[in-house]
Protein backbone atom coordinates (compact mmCIF):
# COMPACT_ATOMS: atom_id res chain seq x y z
CA UNK A 1 0.00 0.00 0.00
CA UNK A 2 1.30 3.46 -0.98
CA UNK A 3 0.65 4.80 2.52
CA UNK A 4 3.06 2.36 4.13
CA UNK A 5 6.04 2.99 1.85
CA UNK A 6 8.80 5.20 3.18
CA UNK A 7 10.24 8.05 1.16
CA UNK A 8 13.43 6.81 -0.56
CA UNK A 9 16.67 8.43 0.66
CA UNK A 10 17.47 11.67 -1.17
CA UNK A 11 13.93 12.08 -2.44
CA UNK A 12 12.52 14.32 0.32
CA UNK A 13 11.69 17.56 -1.52
CA UNK A 14 12.34 20.83 0.29
CA UNK A 15 10.49 22.90 -2.27
CA UNK A 16 8.01 22.44 -5.09
CA UNK A 17 9.95 22.27 -8.35
CA UNK A 18 10.00 20.48 -11.70
CA UNK A 19 11.90 17.56 -10.20
CA UNK A 20 8.61 16.33 -8.74
CA UNK A 21 7.32 15.45 -12.21
CA UNK A 22 9.80 12.57 -12.22
CA UNK A 23 8.45 11.04 -9.01
CA UNK A 24 6.36 7.93 -9.24
CA UNK A 25 2.91 8.24 -7.68
CA UNK A 26 3.85 6.25 -4.57
CA UNK A 27 6.93 8.45 -4.11
CA UNK A 28 4.80 11.59 -4.18
CA UNK A 29 2.50 10.00 -1.60
CA UNK A 30 5.45 9.06 0.59
CA UNK A 31 7.62 12.15 0.21
CA UNK A 32 5.54 15.26 -0.37
CA UNK A 33 4.39 17.31 2.58
CA UNK A 34 0.99 19.05 2.47
CA UNK A 35 2.20 22.19 4.22
CA UNK A 36 4.98 22.60 1.66
CA UNK A 37 2.39 22.36 -1.14
CA UNK A 38 0.19 24.92 0.61
CA UNK A 39 3.09 27.36 0.88
CA UNK A 40 3.92 27.04 -2.82
CA UNK A 41 0.57 26.72 -4.61
CA UNK A 42 1.77 29.13 -7.30
CA UNK A 43 4.39 26.57 -8.34
CA UNK A 44 1.97 23.65 -8.07
CA UNK A 45 -0.13 25.50 -10.66
CA UNK A 46 2.79 26.50 -12.84
CA UNK A 47 4.64 23.21 -13.21
CA UNK A 48 3.27 20.68 -15.72
CA UNK A 49 2.11 18.07 -13.24
CA UNK A 50 -0.24 15.44 -14.64
CA UNK A 51 -3.81 15.03 -13.40
CA UNK A 52 -2.71 11.97 -11.42
CA UNK A 53 0.05 13.91 -9.70
CA UNK A 54 -2.28 16.80 -8.94
CA UNK A 55 -4.80 14.40 -7.47
CA UNK A 56 -2.09 13.09 -5.12
CA UNK A 57 -1.27 16.69 -4.12
CA UNK A 58 -4.94 17.27 -3.41
CA UNK A 59 -5.03 14.14 -1.25
CA UNK A 60 -1.99 15.45 0.68
CA UNK A 61 -3.67 18.83 1.23
CA UNK A 62 -6.89 17.16 2.34
CA UNK A 63 -4.96 15.11 4.88
CA UNK A 64 -3.10 18.17 6.12
CA UNK A 65 -6.34 20.18 6.49
CA UNK A 66 -9.07 17.65 7.35
CA UNK A 67 -11.36 20.45 8.62
CA UNK A 68 -11.16 22.30 5.29
CA UNK A 69 -8.48 24.51 3.73
CA UNK A 70 -7.56 27.71 5.58
CA UNK A 71 -8.46 30.95 3.81
CA UNK A 72 -4.76 31.74 3.34
CA UNK A 73 -4.49 28.63 1.13
CA UNK A 74 -7.83 29.18 -0.61
CA UNK A 75 -6.61 32.63 -1.68
CA UNK A 76 -3.61 31.00 -3.39
CA UNK A 77 -5.42 28.08 -5.03
CA UNK A 78 -5.55 29.56 -8.53
CA UNK A 79 -6.02 26.86 -11.17
CA UNK A 80 -5.86 24.15 -8.49
CA UNK A 81 -9.45 25.19 -7.68
CA UNK A 82 -10.43 23.07 -10.70
CA UNK A 83 -9.55 19.89 -8.79
CA UNK A 84 -11.63 20.74 -5.74
CA UNK A 85 -15.13 19.29 -5.29
CA UNK A 86 -18.28 21.10 -4.06
CA UNK A 87 -18.14 18.85 -0.97
CA UNK A 88 -14.63 20.14 -0.18
CA UNK A 89 -15.79 23.73 -0.60
CA UNK A 90 -18.68 23.30 1.84
CA UNK A 91 -16.05 22.82 4.56
CA UNK A 92 -14.34 26.12 3.83
CA UNK A 93 -14.69 29.46 5.52
CA UNK A 94 -14.31 32.25 2.97
CA UNK A 95 -14.69 35.88 3.98
CA UNK A 96 -12.86 37.77 1.23
CA UNK A 97 -14.89 38.83 -1.83
CA UNK A 98 -11.64 39.09 -3.81
CA UNK A 99 -10.88 35.42 -3.15
CA UNK A 100 -14.33 34.50 -4.43
CA UNK A 101 -14.00 36.62 -7.57
CA UNK A 102 -10.52 35.25 -8.34
CA UNK A 103 -11.67 31.65 -8.06
CA UNK A 104 -14.82 32.33 -10.06
CA UNK A 105 -12.58 33.62 -12.84
CA UNK A 106 -10.60 30.35 -12.72
CA UNK A 107 -13.80 28.29 -12.93
CA UNK A 108 -15.23 30.22 -15.90
CA UNK A 109 -15.91 27.99 -18.90
CA UNK A 110 -14.65 24.91 -17.05
CA UNK A 111 -17.97 23.08 -16.38
CA UNK A 112 -17.56 24.03 -12.73
CA UNK A 113 -20.99 25.45 -11.93
CA UNK A 114 -21.39 23.28 -8.83
CA UNK A 115 -18.04 24.44 -7.40
CA UNK A 116 -18.77 28.09 -8.18
CA UNK A 117 -22.17 27.91 -6.48
CA UNK A 118 -20.73 26.10 -3.46
CA UNK A 119 -18.05 28.78 -3.16
CA UNK A 120 -20.56 31.63 -3.19
CA UNK A 121 -22.81 29.80 -0.72
CA UNK A 122 -19.84 29.31 1.59
CA UNK A 123 -19.00 33.01 1.32
CA UNK A 124 -22.58 34.01 2.16
CA UNK A 125 -22.59 31.61 5.10
CA UNK A 126 -19.61 33.49 6.46
CA UNK A 127 -21.57 36.74 6.36
CA UNK A 128 -20.44 37.92 2.92
CA UNK A 129 -22.65 39.88 0.53
CA UNK A 130 -23.52 38.66 -2.96
CA UNK A 131 -23.10 41.87 -4.93
CA UNK A 132 -23.77 42.43 -8.62
CA UNK A 133 -20.04 42.18 -9.35
CA UNK A 134 -20.09 38.68 -7.98
CA UNK A 135 -23.19 37.73 -9.93
CA UNK A 136 -21.40 38.98 -13.05
CA UNK A 137 -18.35 36.94 -12.08
CA UNK A 138 -20.65 33.91 -11.91
CA UNK A 139 -21.12 34.69 -15.58
CA UNK A 140 -23.27 32.36 -17.62
CA UNK A 141 -24.30 30.16 -14.71
CA UNK A 142 -28.12 30.27 -14.59
CA UNK A 143 -29.31 32.02 -11.44
CA UNK A 144 -31.02 28.76 -10.44
CA UNK A 145 -28.16 28.60 -7.93
CA UNK A 146 -30.24 30.92 -5.76
CA UNK A 147 -32.40 27.88 -5.03
CA UNK A 148 -29.35 25.99 -3.77
CA UNK A 149 -28.56 28.57 -1.11
CA UNK A 150 -29.98 28.04 2.34
CA UNK A 151 -32.81 30.43 3.29
CA UNK A 152 -30.33 32.12 5.66
CA UNK A 153 -27.89 32.64 2.77
CA UNK A 154 -30.69 34.10 0.68
CA UNK A 155 -31.23 36.84 3.25
CA UNK A 156 -27.83 38.28 2.39
CA UNK A 157 -28.55 38.39 -1.36
CA UNK A 158 -29.26 42.03 -2.23
CA UNK A 159 -32.63 42.77 -3.86
CA UNK A 160 -30.86 44.29 -6.87
CA UNK A 161 -29.82 40.77 -7.96
CA UNK A 162 -33.51 40.05 -8.67
CA UNK A 163 -33.22 42.14 -11.84
CA UNK A 164 -30.97 39.45 -13.30
CA UNK A 165 -33.23 36.45 -12.60
CA UNK A 166 -34.88 34.78 -15.61
CA UNK A 167 -38.10 32.70 -15.75
CA UNK A 168 -36.37 29.29 -15.82
CA UNK A 169 -34.01 30.15 -12.99
CA UNK A 170 -36.56 29.42 -10.26
CA UNK A 171 -38.02 26.20 -11.63
CA UNK A 172 -36.40 24.01 -8.97
CA UNK A 173 -36.88 26.37 -6.03
CA UNK A 174 -38.65 25.18 -2.89
CA UNK A 175 -41.76 27.03 -1.73
CA UNK A 176 -39.78 28.62 1.07
CA UNK A 177 -37.15 29.91 -1.34
CA UNK A 178 -39.80 31.27 -3.69
CA UNK A 179 -41.47 33.13 -0.83
CA UNK A 180 -38.19 34.78 0.17
CA UNK A 181 -37.25 35.62 -3.41
CA UNK A 182 -40.71 37.06 -4.07
CA UNK A 183 -40.28 39.42 -1.09
CA UNK A 184 -36.89 40.50 -2.43
CA UNK A 185 -38.33 40.99 -5.92
CA UNK A 186 -41.14 43.15 -4.53
CA UNK A 187 -38.64 45.47 -2.92
CA UNK A 188 -36.37 45.42 -6.01
CA UNK A 189 -39.20 46.45 -8.33
CA UNK A 190 -41.05 48.80 -5.99
CA UNK A 191 -40.35 51.84 -8.17
CA UNK A 192 -41.46 50.14 -11.38
CA UNK A 193 -45.02 50.81 -12.46
CA UNK A 194 -47.83 49.18 -14.41
CA UNK A 195 -47.20 46.47 -16.94
CA UNK A 196 -43.43 46.69 -16.61
CA UNK A 197 -43.82 45.81 -12.93
CA UNK A 198 -45.89 42.76 -13.83
CA UNK A 199 -43.37 41.65 -16.48
CA UNK A 200 -40.63 41.77 -13.83
CA UNK A 201 -42.53 40.28 -10.90
CA UNK A 202 -44.17 37.41 -12.81
CA UNK A 203 -40.98 35.33 -12.63
CA UNK A 204 -41.34 35.35 -8.85
CA UNK A 205 -45.10 34.87 -8.49
CA UNK A 206 -44.62 31.26 -7.39
CA UNK A 207 -43.81 32.84 -4.02
CA UNK A 208 -46.85 35.15 -3.91
CA UNK A 209 -49.56 34.82 -1.27
CA UNK A 210 -53.30 34.80 -2.02
CA UNK A 211 -53.42 38.41 -0.79
CA UNK A 212 -50.71 39.42 -3.30
CA UNK A 213 -52.55 37.67 -6.14
CA UNK A 214 -55.83 39.38 -5.22
CA UNK A 215 -54.10 42.74 -5.34
CA UNK A 216 -52.56 41.86 -8.69
CA UNK A 217 -55.93 40.87 -10.13
CA UNK A 218 -57.07 44.49 -9.77
CA UNK A 219 -54.55 45.67 -12.36
CA UNK A 220 -55.65 44.08 -15.66
CA UNK A 221 -52.38 42.20 -16.02
CA UNK A 222 -53.66 39.47 -18.39
CA UNK A 223 -51.47 36.78 -16.84
CA UNK A 224 -50.49 34.03 -19.27
CA UNK A 225 -51.31 30.42 -18.45
CA UNK A 226 -47.62 29.46 -18.06
CA UNK A 227 -47.25 32.00 -15.22
CA UNK A 228 -50.58 30.93 -13.73
CA UNK A 229 -49.39 27.31 -13.62
CA UNK A 230 -46.35 28.38 -11.60
CA UNK A 231 -48.44 29.90 -8.80
CA UNK A 232 -48.40 27.96 -5.58
CA UNK A 233 -51.49 25.83 -5.06
CA UNK A 234 -52.13 27.15 -1.54
CA UNK A 235 -52.39 30.71 -2.84
CA UNK A 236 -54.33 29.82 -5.96
CA UNK A 237 -57.11 27.89 -4.27
CA UNK A 238 -57.98 30.95 -2.20
CA UNK A 239 -58.94 32.92 -5.33
CA UNK A 240 -62.53 33.11 -6.52
CA UNK A 241 -63.59 32.54 -10.12
CA UNK A 242 -64.11 36.29 -10.53
CA UNK A 243 -60.61 37.02 -9.25
CA UNK A 244 -59.01 34.46 -11.58
CA UNK A 245 -61.04 35.90 -14.45
CA UNK A 246 -59.60 39.34 -13.69
CA UNK A 247 -56.10 37.93 -13.27
CA UNK A 248 -56.05 36.05 -16.60
CA UNK A 249 -58.16 38.45 -18.65
CA UNK A 250 -58.47 37.10 -22.22
CA UNK A 251 -56.13 34.21 -21.31
CA UNK A 252 -58.94 32.66 -19.22
CA UNK A 253 -59.77 30.43 -22.22
CA UNK A 254 -56.46 28.57 -21.70
CA UNK A 255 -57.78 27.07 -18.45
CA UNK A 256 -59.68 24.49 -20.49
CA UNK A 257 -56.49 22.82 -21.79
CA UNK A 258 -55.13 22.61 -18.24
CA UNK A 259 -58.29 21.54 -16.36
CA UNK A 260 -57.05 18.04 -15.56
CA UNK A 261 -53.58 19.15 -14.45
CA UNK A 262 -52.32 20.69 -11.21
CA UNK A 263 -52.62 23.49 -10.13
CA UNK A 264 -55.65 24.31 -12.33
CA UNK A 265 -57.36 21.07 -11.29
CA UNK A 266 -56.78 21.90 -7.60
CA UNK A 267 -58.28 25.33 -8.11
CA UNK A 268 -61.31 23.92 -9.96
CA UNK A 269 -62.00 21.51 -7.09
CA UNK A 270 -62.41 24.48 -4.75
CA UNK A 271 -64.84 26.45 -6.97
CA UNK A 272 -68.61 26.12 -7.20
CA UNK A 273 -69.55 24.54 -10.50
CA UNK A 274 -72.21 27.20 -11.11
CA UNK A 275 -69.48 29.91 -10.96
CA UNK A 276 -67.34 27.95 -13.40
CA UNK A 277 -70.31 27.46 -15.72
CA UNK A 278 -70.73 31.23 -15.96
CA UNK A 279 -67.33 31.39 -17.69
CA UNK A 280 -68.79 29.42 -20.59
CA UNK A 281 -65.61 27.40 -21.08
CA UNK A 282 -67.08 24.00 -20.23
CA UNK A 283 -64.78 23.64 -17.21
CA UNK A 284 -65.64 20.62 -15.06
CA UNK A 285 -64.61 19.43 -11.59
CA UNK A 286 -66.11 22.17 -9.44
CA UNK A 287 -68.19 21.67 -6.30
CA UNK A 288 -71.63 20.47 -7.40
CA UNK A 289 -74.57 22.67 -6.56
CA UNK A 290 -76.00 21.78 -3.14
CA UNK A 291 -72.59 20.77 -1.76
CA UNK A 292 -70.68 22.63 0.91
CA UNK A 293 -66.94 22.34 1.47
CA UNK A 294 -66.33 22.01 5.18
CA UNK A 295 -62.72 20.97 4.80
CA UNK A 296 -60.25 21.64 2.02
CA UNK A 297 -59.74 17.93 1.48
CA UNK A 298 -63.20 16.43 2.16
CA UNK A 299 -66.48 17.03 0.28
CA UNK A 300 -69.57 16.55 2.39
CA UNK A 301 -73.18 16.36 1.12
CA UNK A 302 -75.24 19.31 2.34
CA UNK A 303 -78.52 18.03 3.75
Amino acid sequence: DAEQKACPPGKEPYKVDEDLIFYQNWELEACVDGTMLARQMDLVNEIPFTYEQLSIFKHKLDKTYPQGYPESLIQQLGHFFRYVSPEDIHQWNVTSPDTVKTLLKVSKGQKMNAQAIALVACYLRGGGQLDEDMVKALGDIPLSYLCDFSPQDLHSVPSSVMWLVGPQDLDKCSQRHLGLLYQKACSAFQNVSGLEYFEKIKTFLGGASVKDLRALSQHNVSMDIATFKRLQVDSLVGLSVAEVQKLLGPNIVDLKTEEDKSPVRDWLFRQHQKDLDRLGLGLQGGIPNGYLVLDFNVREAFS
Partner: antibody
Protein backbone atom coordinates in the same frame (compact mmCIF):
# COMPACT_ATOMS: atom_id res chain seq x y z
CA UNK B 1 26.20 29.96 -27.83
CA UNK B 2 23.99 27.00 -26.87
CA UNK B 3 24.55 23.96 -29.06
CA UNK B 4 23.30 20.37 -29.02
CA UNK B 5 25.33 18.11 -31.32
CA UNK B 6 24.02 14.61 -32.01
CA UNK B 7 25.74 11.43 -33.19
CA UNK B 8 25.59 10.31 -36.83
CA UNK B 9 23.02 8.29 -38.76
CA UNK B 10 22.50 4.61 -37.93
CA UNK B 11 21.13 1.62 -39.84
CA UNK B 12 19.80 -1.21 -37.67
CA UNK B 13 18.10 -4.55 -38.13
CA UNK B 14 14.67 -5.25 -36.60
CA UNK B 15 15.02 -6.46 -33.00
CA UNK B 16 18.31 -4.64 -32.46
CA UNK B 17 18.95 -1.59 -30.26
CA UNK B 18 20.26 1.88 -31.08
CA UNK B 19 21.93 4.44 -28.80
CA UNK B 20 21.93 8.09 -29.90
CA UNK B 21 24.07 10.71 -28.14
CA UNK B 22 23.54 14.44 -27.69
CA UNK B 23 26.49 16.61 -26.57
CA UNK B 24 25.61 19.96 -25.00
CA UNK B 25 27.78 23.06 -24.98
CA UNK B 26 27.42 26.79 -24.34
CA UNK B 27 25.49 26.38 -21.07
CA UNK B 28 25.62 24.43 -17.80
CA UNK B 29 24.53 20.93 -18.81
CA UNK B 30 22.93 20.15 -15.44
CA UNK B 31 20.88 23.37 -15.52
CA UNK B 32 18.24 22.18 -18.00
CA UNK B 33 16.37 18.96 -18.68
CA UNK B 34 16.88 17.18 -22.00
CA UNK B 35 13.96 15.80 -24.03
CA UNK B 36 13.95 13.38 -26.91
CA UNK B 37 11.53 13.86 -29.79
CA UNK B 38 11.29 11.77 -32.93
CA UNK B 39 9.91 12.35 -36.41
CA UNK B 40 9.06 9.51 -38.79
CA UNK B 41 9.50 10.26 -42.53
CA UNK B 42 6.80 12.70 -43.65
CA UNK B 43 5.19 12.63 -40.20
CA UNK B 44 4.84 15.00 -37.24
CA UNK B 45 6.86 15.36 -34.04
CA UNK B 46 6.43 12.81 -31.27
CA UNK B 47 7.63 13.37 -27.71
CA UNK B 48 9.46 10.36 -26.25
CA UNK B 49 10.63 11.42 -22.81
CA UNK B 50 12.71 13.69 -20.61
CA UNK B 51 15.78 13.33 -18.38
CA UNK B 52 16.94 15.42 -15.47
CA UNK B 53 20.73 15.60 -16.08
CA UNK B 54 21.55 16.43 -12.45
CA UNK B 55 19.93 13.38 -10.90
CA UNK B 56 19.44 11.12 -13.90
CA UNK B 57 15.70 10.91 -13.23
CA UNK B 58 13.60 10.10 -16.28
CA UNK B 59 10.00 10.31 -17.43
CA UNK B 60 8.97 8.43 -20.58
CA UNK B 61 5.94 8.69 -22.85
CA UNK B 62 3.70 5.69 -22.23
CA UNK B 63 4.16 4.48 -25.79
CA UNK B 64 7.91 3.95 -25.29
CA UNK B 65 7.85 2.67 -21.70
CA UNK B 66 9.90 -0.52 -21.43
CA UNK B 67 11.75 0.06 -24.73
CA UNK B 68 13.47 3.39 -24.16
CA UNK B 69 16.26 4.25 -21.74
CA UNK B 70 17.58 7.76 -21.29
CA UNK B 71 20.87 8.31 -19.52
CA UNK B 72 23.50 11.02 -19.21
CA UNK B 73 27.18 11.50 -18.48
CA UNK B 74 27.63 14.84 -16.73
CA UNK B 75 31.44 14.68 -17.01
CA UNK B 76 31.19 15.08 -20.78
CA UNK B 77 27.84 16.99 -20.86
CA UNK B 78 26.20 14.31 -22.95
CA UNK B 79 22.72 12.78 -22.89
CA UNK B 80 21.88 9.40 -24.44
CA UNK B 81 18.72 7.77 -25.72
CA UNK B 82 18.65 4.03 -26.27
CA UNK B 83 15.72 2.36 -28.03
CA UNK B 84 15.52 -1.43 -28.02
CA UNK B 85 13.51 -4.10 -29.89
CA UNK B 86 13.57 -1.92 -32.99
CA UNK B 87 10.92 -2.36 -35.66
CA UNK B 88 10.54 -0.79 -39.09
CA UNK B 89 8.11 1.86 -37.73
CA UNK B 90 10.94 3.17 -35.52
CA UNK B 91 12.63 4.51 -38.66
CA UNK B 92 12.75 8.24 -37.89
CA UNK B 93 14.90 11.26 -37.20
CA UNK B 94 15.56 11.45 -33.44
CA UNK B 95 16.11 14.88 -31.92
CA UNK B 96 17.34 15.92 -28.51
CA UNK B 97 15.91 19.24 -27.30
CA UNK B 98 16.66 21.38 -24.27
CA UNK B 99 13.71 22.07 -21.96
CA UNK B 100 13.56 25.63 -20.69
CA UNK B 101 12.66 25.83 -16.99
CA UNK B 102 9.59 27.82 -16.11
CA UNK B 103 8.12 27.92 -19.59
CA UNK B 104 8.43 24.23 -20.59
CA UNK B 105 9.42 24.91 -24.12
CA UNK B 106 12.04 23.24 -26.29
CA UNK B 107 14.29 26.25 -26.79
CA UNK B 108 17.27 24.55 -28.48
CA UNK B 109 17.33 21.43 -30.66
CA UNK B 110 20.02 19.05 -31.87
CA UNK B 111 20.45 18.65 -35.62
CA UNK B 112 18.77 15.23 -35.53
CA UNK B 113 19.95 11.64 -36.02
CA UNK B 114 18.38 9.47 -38.71
CA UNK B 115 17.84 5.89 -37.53
CA UNK B 116 16.82 3.47 -40.27
CA UNK B 117 15.45 0.07 -39.28
CA UNK B 118 15.56 -2.37 -42.16
CA UNK B 119 16.19 -6.05 -42.69
CA UNK C 1 -2.34 9.53 -31.30
CA UNK C 2 -2.37 13.29 -31.83
CA UNK C 3 -4.28 15.31 -29.26
CA UNK C 4 -3.73 18.73 -30.83
CA UNK C 5 -5.44 19.19 -34.19
CA UNK C 6 -3.93 21.35 -36.94
CA UNK C 7 -4.96 21.72 -40.58
CA UNK C 8 -2.62 19.62 -42.76
CA UNK C 9 -1.86 22.54 -45.06
CA UNK C 10 -2.40 26.25 -45.63
CA UNK C 11 -1.22 28.51 -48.41
CA UNK C 12 -0.95 32.17 -49.25
CA UNK C 13 0.62 34.54 -51.76
CA UNK C 14 3.63 36.67 -50.83
CA UNK C 15 2.62 39.68 -48.71
CA UNK C 16 -0.60 38.02 -47.57
CA UNK C 17 -1.64 37.05 -44.03
CA UNK C 18 -2.24 33.42 -43.09
CA UNK C 19 -3.32 31.79 -39.84
CA UNK C 20 -2.78 28.26 -38.59
CA UNK C 21 -5.15 26.90 -35.99
CA UNK C 22 -4.44 24.40 -33.23
CA UNK C 23 -7.33 22.84 -31.36
CA UNK C 24 -6.99 20.91 -28.11
CA UNK C 25 -8.88 20.35 -24.88
CA UNK C 26 -9.04 21.52 -21.28
CA UNK C 27 -6.29 19.07 -20.29
CA UNK C 28 -3.76 20.72 -22.61
CA UNK C 29 -4.32 24.08 -24.34
CA UNK C 30 -7.13 24.94 -21.92
CA UNK C 31 -4.85 24.90 -18.89
CA UNK C 32 -1.32 25.45 -20.19
CA UNK C 33 0.84 27.67 -22.36
CA UNK C 34 1.16 26.97 -26.09
CA UNK C 35 4.35 27.22 -28.11
CA UNK C 36 4.90 27.09 -31.88
CA UNK C 37 7.82 25.61 -33.82
CA UNK C 38 8.92 26.21 -37.40
CA UNK C 39 10.64 23.40 -39.28
CA UNK C 40 12.25 24.42 -42.53
CA UNK C 41 12.77 21.57 -45.04
CA UNK C 42 15.55 19.21 -43.92
CA UNK C 43 16.29 21.02 -40.65
CA UNK C 44 15.47 20.66 -36.96
CA UNK C 45 12.46 22.49 -35.53
CA UNK C 46 13.07 26.01 -34.21
CA UNK C 47 11.14 27.79 -31.45
CA UNK C 48 8.93 30.50 -32.94
CA UNK C 49 6.41 31.46 -30.20
CA UNK C 50 6.24 30.55 -26.51
CA UNK C 51 3.83 31.31 -23.62
CA UNK C 52 0.95 31.64 -26.14
CA UNK C 53 2.16 34.89 -27.71
CA UNK C 54 5.82 35.66 -26.84
CA UNK C 55 8.53 35.77 -29.51
CA UNK C 56 12.12 34.72 -28.76
CA UNK C 57 14.70 37.29 -29.82
CA UNK C 58 15.47 37.05 -33.53
CA UNK C 59 11.96 36.00 -34.55
CA UNK C 60 10.38 38.70 -36.77
CA UNK C 61 7.24 40.43 -35.49
CA UNK C 62 5.40 39.16 -38.59
CA UNK C 63 4.82 36.03 -36.48
CA UNK C 64 2.27 36.26 -33.68
CA UNK C 65 0.45 33.80 -31.47
CA UNK C 66 -2.89 33.93 -29.68
CA UNK C 67 -5.06 31.64 -27.61
CA UNK C 68 -8.72 31.44 -26.66
CA UNK C 69 -10.13 28.66 -24.51
CA UNK C 70 -8.96 25.33 -25.88
CA UNK C 71 -7.70 26.68 -29.23
CA UNK C 72 -4.59 28.55 -30.26
CA UNK C 73 -3.51 30.11 -33.52
CA UNK C 74 -0.39 31.34 -35.25
CA UNK C 75 -0.66 34.31 -37.60
CA UNK C 76 1.94 35.21 -40.21
CA UNK C 77 1.63 38.59 -41.92
CA UNK C 78 3.54 39.86 -44.95
CA UNK C 79 4.17 36.30 -46.11
CA UNK C 80 7.63 35.65 -47.57
CA UNK C 81 8.94 32.73 -49.60
CA UNK C 82 11.33 31.76 -46.77
CA UNK C 83 8.31 31.16 -44.50
CA UNK C 84 7.54 27.99 -46.49
CA UNK C 85 7.92 25.30 -43.82
CA UNK C 86 6.07 22.96 -41.46
CA UNK C 87 4.61 24.56 -38.32
CA UNK C 88 3.85 22.69 -35.11
CA UNK C 89 1.92 23.78 -32.05
CA UNK C 90 2.91 22.26 -28.74
CA UNK C 91 1.91 22.32 -25.10
CA UNK C 92 1.97 19.90 -22.23
CA UNK C 93 -0.95 17.72 -21.47
CA UNK C 94 -2.19 16.93 -17.98
CA UNK C 95 -2.68 13.32 -19.06
CA UNK C 96 0.28 12.52 -21.30
CA UNK C 97 2.78 15.21 -20.34
CA UNK C 98 4.10 16.71 -23.58
CA UNK C 99 2.29 16.94 -26.90
CA UNK C 100 2.64 18.29 -30.42
CA UNK C 101 0.05 19.02 -33.07
CA UNK C 102 0.12 17.01 -36.28
CA UNK C 103 1.85 19.86 -38.11
CA UNK C 104 0.75 22.22 -40.89
CA UNK C 105 2.57 22.61 -44.21
CA UNK C 106 2.66 26.26 -45.28
CA UNK C 107 3.02 26.82 -49.03
CA UNK C 108 3.89 30.28 -50.34
CA UNK C 109 2.29 30.58 -53.78
CA UNK C 110 3.86 32.08 -56.86
Amino acid sequence: QVQLVQSGAEVKKPGASVKVSCKASGYTFTGNYINWVRQAPGQGLEWMGIINPTKGWTLYAQKFQGRVTMTRDTSISTAYMELSSLRSEDTAVYYCARWHHGTWIFDYWGQGTLVTVSS
Amino acid sequence: DIVLTQPPSVSGAPGQRVTISCSGSSSNIGSNYVSWYQQLPGTAPKLLIYNDNQRPSGVPDRFSGSKSGTSASLAITGLQSEDEADYYCSTYDRRTFSVFGGGTKLTVLG
